[in-house]
């Protein structure tokens, strides 16, 4: 049950992840105009990864999409690329985890086959995460250099009457969005691949252990993890797990090297 | 068609008050930034004051802060610029002005309401 | 505040000739988002309240006649009237719409011989 709850807490919260930094990748503010030397600016600025606006004091919004493809600062490539490497991994992720929820069944699919899509899944979780929150980090460090950089060019240079205005730009709604998105994301991750150790089957796994008393033969056969009450004997102290969805009857005693003769 | 009407004002002695009112019409009222401009007898244009459409921010020259409010009322389609501590200065034809969609303008001009202090 | 300086303060011409007037601001005017000057132009003739004639620096309002153009960029602004006609006999103002307080230019009275 705790399995079931973690991998689809797990899924969900990855779900709202993925939906933040799909989100976060279209926003037009991944930075804002910095109105902290002219709070009362009628043209407000910002920029998103795809084009920049400009919205005026009437409402009017002007948006200018970035046409060309060389001419783009590296880093904004830089960007777009880890977003657009994180929704598609998120994507595939969200794809693969439907299957491995505990709760649908597909077929006869075995738990060990869900076990490893529930790992597959978190991984890439985990991996669109962090191509999210770097990529947010790498712009919101790519906005702190040119902020200190205009500012110093704003003190320098104005010898003469005419000033000229250098638009600062400081973080905007989407550099949040995209961060929450990136942990949220990352901790679905992260839920996943717990869930994933609680399908999996244990790699020994101990059927039955024959005890063989003098005179007549009687096998004690423990039963498998969903049949038994919880008192079977066990030679390691480990669960024992029963691999398909057999009766306790239909459990085979085989000898081992653990037989008591 | 695009209509502004000024009214309300008169002759009033330094450090009174007075209510000039702009009605509008021909257009949706709150879809629109608002501004007052005044003209001095003789002088040039001098922007006063401006409400944006959904009457949340309104801005006003350094001038007049503090002493002169601009408000609206979009149910009575009517602009408002309450004035008081008035001074001599102040003594002007007070036009009221709807904000273009495009480029910060002023699109529409009302014929304007005079105010004149004096003692 | 932004200053707006307007030159000449008036000029005298003849009908149909051609004329320019100039409007400088203190501070540029080009915004870099979208690459537009927020300069506006006003025409007020006498006794009657302004009229928008450009904004954008250059993008004439709707019912404007082409003789009327606009021009420049950052602080240095033109007002062309390419033919003058008697019906243009006012004063034309610049006013200046990036940043608020919003500042007008003293004006360019333009009158017809």
């Known amino acids: 049950m705790a399995v079931t709850a973690c991998q689809g807490l797990g899924f969900v919260v990855s779900l709202i992840g993925i939906a933040g930094i799909i989100a976060a990748t279209c926003m037009d503010q991944w930075s804002t105009q910095d109105l902290y030397n002219n709070p009362v600016t009628a043209v407000f600025n910002y920029q998103g990864l795809w084009r920049s606006c400009v919205r005026e004091s009437s409402g009017f919004t002007e948006c200018r999409g970035y046409f060309t493809l060389l001419g783009l600062p590296a880093m904004l490539q830089a960007v777009r690329a880890l977003m657009i490497v994180g929704i598609v991994l998120g994507a595939i992720g969200l794809l693969v985890s439907i299957f491995a929820l505990k709760c649908i069944r597909i077929g006869s699919m075995e738990d060990s086959a869900k076990a490893n899509m529930t790992l597959t899944s978190g991984i890439m979780f985990i991996v669109s995460g962090l191509c999210a929150i770097a990529g947010v980090s790498v712009f919101a460090n790519m906005l702190v250099t040119n902020f200190w950089m205009s500012t110093a060019n704003m003190y320098t240079g104005m010898g003469g009457m005419v000033q000229t205005v250098q638009t600062r730009y400081t973080f905007g709604a989407a550099l949040f969005v995209g961060w929450v998105a990136g942990g949220l994301t990352l901790i679905g991750g992260v839920m996943m691949c717990i869930a994933c150790r609680g399908l999996a089957p244990e790699e020994t796994n101990y059927k039955a252990v024959s005890y063989h008393a003098s005179g007549h033969s009687v096998a004690y056969k423990p039963g498998g993890f969903k049949a038994s009450t919880g008192f079977g004997s066990n030679t390691k102290n480990k669960k024992i797990y029963d691999g398909g969805a057999r009766t306790e009857d239909e459990v085979q005693s085989y000898p081992s090297k653990h037989d008591y003769v | 068609e695009v209509k502004l009407q000024e009214s309300g004002g008169g002759l009033v002695k330094p450090g009174g008050s007075l209510k000039v009112s702009c009605a509008a019409s021909?257009?949706?009222?709150?879809?629109?930034?608002m501004h007052w401009v005044r003209q001095a007898p003789e002088k040039g244009l001098e922007w006063v004051a401006y409400?944006?459409?959904?009457?949340?921010?309104?801005y006003s020259t350094d001038t007049v802060k503090g002493r002169f409010t601009i408000s609206r009322d979009s149910a009575k389609h009517t602009l408002f610029l309450q004035m008081t501590s008035l001074r001599s200065e102040d003594t002007a034809m007070y036009y009221c002005?709807?904000?273009?969609?495009?480029?910060?303008?002023?699109?529409?001009w009302g014929q304007g309401t005079s105010v004149t202090v004096s003692s | 505040d932004i200053v707006m300086t307007q030159s000449p303060s008036s000029l005298t011409v003849t009908a149909g000739e051609r004329v320019t007037m100039s409007c400088k601001s203190s501070?540029?005017?080009?915004?870099?988002?979208?690459?537009?000057?927020?300069l506006t132009w006003y025409q007020q003739k006498p006794g009657q309240p302004p009229k928008l004639l450009i904004y954008?620096?250059?993008t004439r309002e709707s019912g404007v006649p082409d003789r009327f153009t606009g021009s420049g960029s950052g602080t240095d602004f033109t007002l062309t009237i390419s033919s003058v006609q008697a019906e243009d006999l006012a004063v034309y103002f610049c006013?200046?719409?990036?940043?608020?307080?919003?500042?007008f230019g003293s004006g360019t009275k333009l009158e017809i011989k």
């Open positions: 002005a709807r904000g273009s969609y495009y480029g910060n303008a002023m699109d529409y």
């Open positions: 021909g257009f949706t009222f709150s879809d629109y930034g």
């Open positions: 954008w620096a250059s």
């Open positions: 409400i944006s459409r959904g009457r949340s921010t309104t």
């Open positions: 006013q200046s719409a990036y940043s608020y307080p919003f500042t």
């Open positions: 501070q540029s005017l080009l915004n870099s988002g979208n690459q537009r000057n927020y």
